[in-house]
């Protein structure tokens, strides 16, 4: 999906009002310096691409974050504020339902959510000091 035409300001507002708090809740008890940055993004559409990938794609050691509160709110925000996003996610959602497993918070998942926090921070501060 091409995130170029999303309403970035509305997504930013959704992040600031709820998603950020849910990410903090998930990471509670973890030091903010515990994980180094291993993923970055270079503009707002790129950030959303990487956020979607880390939030909804299973990875080794972290089978699924998609049922977490922050993930469901992320999905809702993208569905509302990115034209045509919902349609691209129907097949992915059906596959995810079949894979549903019991929820276990592994260290790998904590690391992944730490990277998500970094990506969201970058999404929300697009204007570096203009040089």
């Amino acid at each position: 999906y091409d995130f170029t035409n999303c309403d970035f300001e509305k997504i930013k507002a959704a992040y600031l009002s709820t998603i950020s708090k849910d990410l903090i809740t998930y990471m509670s008890g973890t030091k903010s310096t515990e994980f180094n940055n291993t993923v970055s993004c270079s503009n707002r559409p790129h950030c959303l691409t990487e956020i979607q990938s880390l939030t909804f794609n299973p990875t080794a050691g972290c089978a699924s974050l998609a049922k977490e509160m922050f993930a469901m709110k992320t999905k809702a925000a993208l569905a509302i504020w990115c034209p045509g996003y919902s349609e691209t996610q129907i097949n992915a959602t059906q596959a995810m339902k079949k894979r549903r497993k019991r929820k276990v918070t592994t260290n790998k998942c904590l690391e992944q959510v730490s990277q998500l926090q970094g990506l969201w921070r970058r999404f929300n501060r697009p204007l570096l000091k203009q040089q």
């Epitope: 940055n37 291993t38 970055s40 270079s42 970058r122 570096l128």
Partner: antibody, heavy 122, light 108 residues
Framework: QMQLVESGGGVVQPGRSLRLSCAAS????????MHWVRQAPGKGLEWVAV????????HYADSVKGRFTITRDNSKNTLNLQMNSLRAEDTAVYYC???????????????WGQGTMVTVSS | SYVLTQPPSVSVAPGQTARITCGGN??????VHWYQQKPGQAPVLVVY???DRPSWIPERFSGSNSGNTATLTISRGEAGDEADYYC???????????FGGGTKLTVL
């Protein structure tokens, strides 16, 4: 463990070519801008080139423009520097480094390789 | 193109504060990064975006930037701080990375 490992350095005659490589591991390579920086013996750091995270855009120092080419293969997590028409003044340790970027602005170089020595001599 | 000027050397007594400057035209409008390099080793980022510090760098390292001068401050200097220090900016008008000439810090 995030790591950059350079290879390909060696002794080469003036006018000849050399290809340096940098293998990245421990991070999502395709999301970072990547640089080559060099350091002549006893001298300071000199920036050589940068390539965008996507590989679509490159920038070069005037001293190497037209002679050096920076490329990347995001599927293999590798960065390359093709050096042609080498001169004695290209003798240096060559480092690769990663850099987050925002739009067309490159940020700090937070991870560096250990460097590979290139000696241009007849 | 853009030029960054650093003093070639700075000395500090153990336990005292060292300040290394980096001069450039209106450098306060740019994000300045600082690197430490010990002999035979690769550079290490110690301060980025003027004053932020990577998690692995001690709080003794700090930075500031305004007007035509950026400053790296190393408080409570230690023998292990002896190194070359380089400032760096991204010159977005010419699309270049620019390094200062480097400053050799000696802990007396």
């Amino acid at each position: 463990q995030m790591q950059l490992v350079e290879s390909g350095g060696g002794v080469v005659q003036p006018g000849r070519s050399l290809r340096l490589s940098c293998a990245a591991s421990g991070f999502t390579f395709r999301t970072y801008g990547m640089h080559w920086v060099r350091q002549a013996p006893g001298k300071g750091l000199e920036w050589v080139a940068v390539i965008w995270y996507s590989g679509t855009t490159t920038h070069y120092a005037d001293s190497v423009k037209g002679r050096f080419t920076i490329t990347r293969d995001n599927s293999k997590n590798t960065l390359n520097l093709q050096m042609n028409s080498l001169r004695a003044e290209d003798t240096a340790v060559y480092y690769c480094s990663r850099s987050p970027q925002w739009e067309d602005i490159f940020e700090s170089m937070d991870i560096w390789g250990q460097g590979t020595m290139v000696t241009v001599s007849s | 193109s853009y030029v960054l000027t650093q003093p070639p050397s700075v000395s500090v007594a153990p336990g005292q504060t060292a300040r290394i400057t980096c001069g450039g035209n209106n450098i306060g409008s740019k994000n300045v990064h600082w690197y430490q390099q010990k002999p035979g080793q690769a550079p290490v980022l110690v301060v980025y975006d003027d004053s932020d510090r990577p998690s692995w760098i001690p709080e003794r390292f700090s930075g500031s930037n305004s007007g035509n001068t950026a400053t790296l401050t190393i408080s409570r200097g230690e023998a292990g701080d002896e190194a070359d220090y380089y400032c760096q900016v991204w010159d977005s008008s010419d699309f270049l990375v620019v390094f200062g000439g480097g400053t050799k810090l000696t802990v007396l």
